[in-house]
Interface confidence: low
């Protein structure tokens, strides 16, 4: 521009464009001044005057340098599945996005447009990839010695206790039940090995050729839950 | 670099309807507007209108009021004149040009009316 | 609507001679904007806001004037000027052109 091009608004020469926080406005042919984020265009320029800028009412933002007749309209309140992650300001739009336990189904630009629940594995199914906040759970068959027993969106399949002797064989959805011989848990990742280990052997065989006795009412289940795997996720 | 491409000839009977378009291309075409401009044989320059190319409004030279008409197909960086129950006196070379003051004009349209 | 007058409608002139082409309004105007016609192309900006010349226009020509009496100046007249030279203004809605000065070289 020309040296003496200082204030807007002002004819940019041919071939050029207006300058930073300017726009060209068609009907003045002059390149104007733009509104600062929480305003907007109140009146717009001619060619011997410059935009005039007003603030933005309550319930509606611009984020960016503009010349928007109208400031935009803030979204609606969150709903009961979400959480208010950014407030509406006259600079920015309010942005919700989906509370724990919820993923969200349907993305906007910023936040969260529809969310939905996470996916709950059933017994016999574990967390094979958990949830994130754009993404379900993912269940899986629990795979041979190893179940699940809960209805949960964060727990995996689970190794079975080994036994010395077994009462009952465990399945998908439960738990060996050992005799009232005190069980022993394989060596699986985050499994718990309980106290007084029967064998250096991990087996799901029996150990010795006797049958089985009935078993007795005081047998040992597992240890607390397994810990949640990161994020959560279902069926 | 920035260009104004129109459409070909035309020629045309009384009270026919001809649409003619101008291709922008080397720059954003919703930054700047588009006006149209009759050069009759042997005659100046008019001034037809302009079209606002960021919100679609047109605006016309009482003249040319009525049966002339601008549109955009913005997507395509395209501007268009559209004329419609054609007399011969709109026998003419129409240009689309930058309403900027930048001077990038289209190459014309010749428009031939004759019956 | 502001009426702009240009003269002369026709003229001739010599390798090296100087030439000035007039356009007068109807009424006040901000600025004046010239272009350059040759036959069979469309229109070049030539001077623009009264006196600034466009890229890639000689430097012999040049423009000036005020309210309603510019002019257009070659300082000396080349074959390749040869061409219609039109007047416009803008600063009154609507835009209007003079009716155009050819200039032919003797």
């Known amino acids: 521009l020309p040296a003496q091009v200082a204030f807007t608004p002002y004819a940019p020469e041919p071939g050029s464009t207006c300058r930073l926080r300017e726009y060209y406005d068609q009907t003045a042919q002059m390149c104007c001044s733009k509104c600062s984020p929480g305003q907007h265009a109140k009146v717009f320029c001619t060619k011997t005057s410059d935009t005039v800028c007003d603030s933005c009412e309550d319930s509606t933002y611009t984020q960016l340098w503009n010349w928007v007749p109208e400031c935009l309209s803030c979204g609606s309140r969150c709903s009961s599945d979400q959480v208010e992650t950014q407030a509406c300001t006259r600079e920015q739009n309010r942005i919700c996005t989906c509370r724990p336990g919820w993923y969200c189904a349907l993305s906007k630009q910023e936040g969260c447009r529809l969310c939905a629940p996470l996916r709950k594995c059933r017994p016999g199914f574990g967390v094979a990839r958990p949830g994130t906040e754009t993404s379900d759970v993912v269940c899986k068959p629990c795979a041979p010695g190893t179940f699940s027993n809960t209805t949960s969106s964060t727990d995996i399949c689970r190794p079975h206790q080994i036994c010395n002797v077994v009462a009952i064989p465990g399945n998908a959805s439960m738990d060996a039940v050992c005799t009232s011989t005190s069980p022993t848990r394989s060596m699986a990742p985050g499994a718990v090995h309980l106290p007084q280990p029967v064998s250096t052997r991990s087996q799901h065989t029996q150990p010795t050729p006797e049958p089985s006795t009935a078993p007795s009412t005081s047998f040992l289940l597992p240890m607390g839950p397994s810990p949640p795997a990161e994020g959560s996720t279902g069926d | 670099q920035i260009q104004l491409v129109q459409s070909g000839p035309e020629l045309k009977k009384p009270g026919e309807t001809v649409k003619i378009s101008c291709k922008a291309s080397?720059?954003?075409?919703?930054?700047?507007?588009m006006q149209w401009v009759q050069k009759m044989p042997g005659k100046g320059f008019k001034w037809i209108g302009w079209i606002n190319t960021h919100s679609g409004e047109p605006k016309y030279a009482e003249d040319f009021k009525g049966r002339f008409a601008f549109s955009l197909e913005t997507s395509a960086s395209t501007a268009y004149l559209q004329i419609s129950n054609l007399k011969n006196e709109d026998t003419a070379t129409y240009f689309c040009a930058r309403w900027d003051g930048t001077g990038y004009w289209g190459q014309g349209t010749t428009l031939t009316v004759s019956s | 609507q502001i009426v702009l007058t240009q003269s002369p409608a026709i003229m001739s002139a010599s390798p090296g001679e100087k030439v000035t082409i007039t356009c007068s309004a109807s009424?006040?105007?901000?600025?004046m904007h010239w272009f350059q016609q040759k036959p069979g192309t469309s229109p070049k900006l030539w001077i623009y806001?009264?006196?600034n010349l466009a890229s890639g226009v000689p430097a012999r020509f040049s423009g000036s004037g005020s309210g309603t009496s510019y002019s257009l100046t070659i300082s000396r007249m080349e074959a390749e000027d040869a061409a219609t030279y039109y007047c416009q203004q803008r600063s009154s809605y609507p835009p209007t052109f003079g009716g155009g000065t050819k200039l032919e070289i003797k």
């Open positions: 080397g720059y954003t075409f919703t930054t700047a507007g």
């Open positions: 009424s006040s105007v901000s600025y």
């Open positions: 806001s009264t006196s």
